[in-house]
Interface confidence: medium
């Protein structure tokens, strides 16, 4: 996929845009709002009726190099007795998100862009059927 | 890729960090073809913590659209169908990366950018605070 | 068509470890769960637990907690469970089945078998 | 726990019979499933949300019930149905099984 141009009806390209070869972009992985943080302190994974473990992802050929996945801790939901109902289902949520990989060519190094998917939580849901046909 | 050359030290030196600034192939590769949308695109109705999606749009950033999730009630959907306030809707929230033109309006330059977005919804037990 | 596929019998040493897999095909394999039913000579079928590939959730039965794990490789489509500590009384048939997507069906509703694979524990 | 019991635990009729199984939970549930083995296969589903029929299952069987009291009946015993049949819940955490009713051929 590629990414869109900017819409000619928006704007006209300025004059300050820096030469970029053909086929390719600039990129500055310096990030914006890098110190923005979510705060982890109120624990919903554990408290939530479909609770989710973290597991970090590593790659140093990745940027950012490190990628927090969650995963649904059991099939069913926790019912308010703290037991599983498997009546219900605990299910991912995911998300898109961009990374850049780094690739090694020899004595070359080249820069792709990636979509990645996060599995960010989990969430109870009623299963459209109950039961096998 | 946009393939750039390593140091004169090339195979031993190796770079651990990314530089600042890289040029990037315009084409995004797209590893996900794990998941299958249609299957989750109903979550938000069938969640026992339902929530709605709101339309977040910005031609400076790409990807230009993001959905962001607002949960429908303070409460969760119990079994008959009613909002239990015993239990608490709450929004799930995640540090995404997309790209901001930098220069503004340009075409072909871009600045990562990390935005908080509210993907989903989950049922939560409160913390009970009793008021002394 | 759907078929579930499971390795070999075996016959373990009392103490040891063993390590069960199930090569599902004819599905999308991260899409189901995947549960084990172990049956021992003359008894009832016991429900021990089920994964999800695409989630990592795993359910057990509390009879079968610190005994048997179940895991998953998504890239081979194969399910194992492993159990530890093995004693007579796990002398058994083990069966993988299919369990629902927690989509259009639930997680639990079970409709796909192995063959089953004999686990046999004598010194 | 629910625990499934079974009745009886082995029976022997003739074909053509009528054939009725029982199961009792423990507590009450609100779907049943029931499951065929036949010697040395691998269980089949038979019957699925108490009272309909699994795919490819002849109409000779049929399923009824709620609560805690549910049966399994074959209006007509033909010699294929030798087996042991399985009443399986999943109403309540873990999934819980019958002990079997053998049924054989007199």
């Known amino acids: 996929r590629k990414i869109p141009k900017v819409g000619h009806t928006f704007f006209q390209k300025p004059e300050s845009c820096p030469p970029v070869p053909g086929g390719s972009m600039k990129l500055d992985i310096g990030i914006i709002n890098e110190n923005q943080r979510v705060s982890m302190s109120r624990n919903i994974e554990s408290r939530s009726t479909s609770p989710w473990n973290y597991t970090v992802t590593w790659d140093p050929n990745r940027y950012p190099s490190e990628v927090v996945q969650a995963q649904c801790r059991n099939l069913g939901c926790i019912n308010a007795q703290g037991k599983e109902d498997i009546s219900m289902n605990s299910v991912p949520i995911q998300q898109e998100t961009l990374v850049v990989r780094r690739k090694h060519q020899g004595c070359s190094v080249s820069f792709q862009l990636e979509k990645v998917l996060v599995t960010v939580g989990c969430t109870c849901v009623t299963p459209v059927i109950h039961h096998v046909q | 890729g946009i393939t750039i050359p390593r140091n004169p030290g090339c195979p031993n030196s190796e770079d651990k960090n990314f530089p600042r600034t890289v040029m990037v192939n315009l084409n995004i590769h797209n590893r996900n073809t794990n998941t299958n949308p249609k299957r989750s695109s109903d979550y938000y109705n069938r969640s026992t913590s339902p929530w709605n999606l709101h339309r977040n749009e910005d031609p400076e950033r790409y990807p230009s659209v993001i959905w962001e999730a607002k949960c429908r009630h303070l409460g969760c959907i119990n079994a008959d169908g009613n909002v239990d306030y015993h239990m608490n809707s709450v929004p799930i929230q995640q540090e995404i990366l997309v790209l901001r033109r930098e220069p503004p309006h340009c075409p072909n330059s871009f600045r990562l950018e990390k935005i908080l977005v509210s993907v989903g919804c989950t049922c939560v037990t409160p913390i009970v605070h009793h008021v002394a | 068509q759907v078929q579930l596929v499971q390795s070999g019998a075996e016959v373990k040493k009392p103490g040891a470890s063993v390590k069960v897999s199930c090569k599902a095909s004819g599905y999308t394999f991260n899409e189901y769960t995947m549960h084990w039913v172990k049956q021992a000579p003359g008894q009832r079928l016991e429900w021990m637990g089920g994964?999800?590939?695409?989630?990592?959730?795993?359910s057990y039965n509390q009879n079968f907690k610190g005994k048997a794990t179940l895991t998953v490789d998504t890239s081979a489509s194969t399910a194992y469970m492993e159990l530890s500590s093995l004693r007579s009384e796990d002398t058994a048939v083990y069966y993988c089945?299919?369990?629902?997507?927690?989509?259009?069906?639930?997680?639990?509703?079970?409709?796909?078998w192995g063959q089953g694979t004999t686990v046999t524990v004598s010194s | 726990d629910i625990q499934m019991t079974q009745s009886p635990s082995s029976l022997s009729a003739s074909v053509g019979d009528r054939v009725t199984i029982t199961c009792s939970a423990s507590s009450s549930v609100n779907y049943m499933h029931w499951y065929q083995q036949k010697p040395g296969k691998v269980p089949k589903l038979l019957i699925y949300?108490?009272?309909k029929l699994a795919s490819g299952v002849p109409s000779r069987f049929s399923g009824s019930g709620s609560g805690t009291d549910f049966t399994l009946t074959i209006s007509s015993l033909q010699p294929e149905d030798v087996a042991t049949y399985y009443c399986q819940q999943w109403n309540s955490h873990p999934l819980t099984f019958g002990q079997g009713t053998k049924l054989e051929i007199k």
């Open positions: 949300d108490t009272s």
């Open positions: 994964i999800n590939p695409n989630s990592g959730g795993v």
């Open positions: 089945a299919r369990g629902g997507d927690g989509y259009y069906t639930n997680y639990f509703d079970i409709d796909y």
